[in-house]
């Protein structure tokens, strides 16, 4: 199958892994989201409109 990480989909230094569901990003500290596109604010809040519960800064998301 096509390489899901070919286009470097993980932003801000995120590390891309081919996964069962396609790809997964390991986000660098300070970023979150499925493609590490959302910065984590200093107060711990994120730029996500509605952050899914249980998210941690830098936690890889599918």
């Amino acid at each position: 199958r096509a390489d899901p990480c070919a286009a470097r989909p993980c932003a801000h230094g995120g590390r891309c892994y081919a996964h069962f569901s396609g790809l997964v990003c390991a986000c660098a500290p300070g970023y979150m989201g499925a493609r590490c596109e959302f910065p984590v604010h200093p107060d711990g809040a994120s730029a996500l409109p509605a952050a899914p519960p249980g998210l941690r800064p830098g936690d890889p998301q599918r």
Partner: antibody
Framework: QEQLVESGGGLVQPEGSLTLTCTAS?????????MCWVRQAPGKGLEWIAC????????TDYANWAKGRFSISKTSSTTVTLQMTSLTVADTATYFC???????????????WGPGTLVTVSS | QVLTQTPSPVSAAVGGTVTISCQAS????????LAWYQQKPGQPPKLLIY???SLASGVPSRFKGSGAGTQFTLTISDLECDDAATYYC????????????FGGGTEVVVK
């Protein structure tokens, strides 16, 4: 069955160069995260050297001490090489190829290793 | 970043328990990106524990990992002769790039 085998080790003179090859069987790199090199000097501990994305992006990560003298590259969907230059006696070690997989939100999990290839730097 | 392990060797009798500690000079990625490996002479390392406390496939439950942040522990209970080996912790970090570091290793002697 999934397997890694290293080759290219041997005796090299100080200041010399050497290229090691890691060959995979039973799987292809593009579906397996990252491929990495780790070394172990005789009687000493493990030392991470570098990793390269198994996919076509070619993304690489290096230990600070390895930058400049060591170069990792993917030459096919089943082979990765480690080019080493300006070798010194301190580079004498068994060099292992290892697969880095993503498991439960963690990375750099080396769940498959080759048997290693010995590099001896001596005059 | 430095990972400091319990000095070698650590010894215990068959059926006993050994505990190996791994102290990181700074928190590992996500506070839990730490793995443990077992290595026997002439063999490559074998992944035992990932995510600080999760057992790798095929590893017996006698092996237990715990800890978070900078302090981690590997406990081997009901020791068997086959457990005689050197054990390494491995932490992952990010600082302008990803990198990984191994502890110095701890030899376990089974009497």
């Amino acid at each position: 069955q999934e397997q890694l085998v290293e080759s290219g080790g041997g005796l090299v003179q100080p200041e010399g160069s050497l290229t090691l090859t890691c060959t995979a069987s039973g799987f292809s790199f593009s579906s397996s995260g990252y491929m990495c090199w780790v070394r172990q000097a005789p009687g000493k501990g493990l030392e991470w050297i570098a990793c390269i994305s198994g996919g076509s992006s070619g993304d690489t990560d290096y230990a600070n001490w390895a930058k400049g003298r060591f170069s990792i590259s993917k030459t096919s969907s089943t082979t990765v090489t480690l080019q080493m230059t300006s070798l010194t006696v301190a580079d004498t070690a068994t060099y292992f190829c290892a697969r880095d997989v993503y498991i439960d939100s963690t990375i750099f999990n080396f769940n498959l290793w080759g048997p290693g290839t010995l590099v001896t730097v001596s005059s | 970043q430095v990972l400091t392990q319990t000095p070698s060797p650590v010894s215990a009798a068959v059926g006993g328990t050994v505990t190996i500690s791994c102290q990181a000079s700074q928190s590992v990625y996500n506070n839990n990106n730490l793995a443990w490996y077992q290595q026997k002479p002439g063999q490559p390392p074998k992944l035992l524990i990932y995510a600080a406390s999760s057992l790798a496939s095929g590893v017996p439950s006698r092996f237990k990992g715990s800890g978070a942040g900078t302090q981690f522990t590997l406990t081997i209970s009901d020791l068997e002769c086959d457990d005689a080996a050197t054990y390494y912790c491995q932490g992952t970090y990010y600082s302008s790039g990803w990198y990984s570091t191994f502890g110095g290793g701890t030899e376990v002697v089974v009497k």
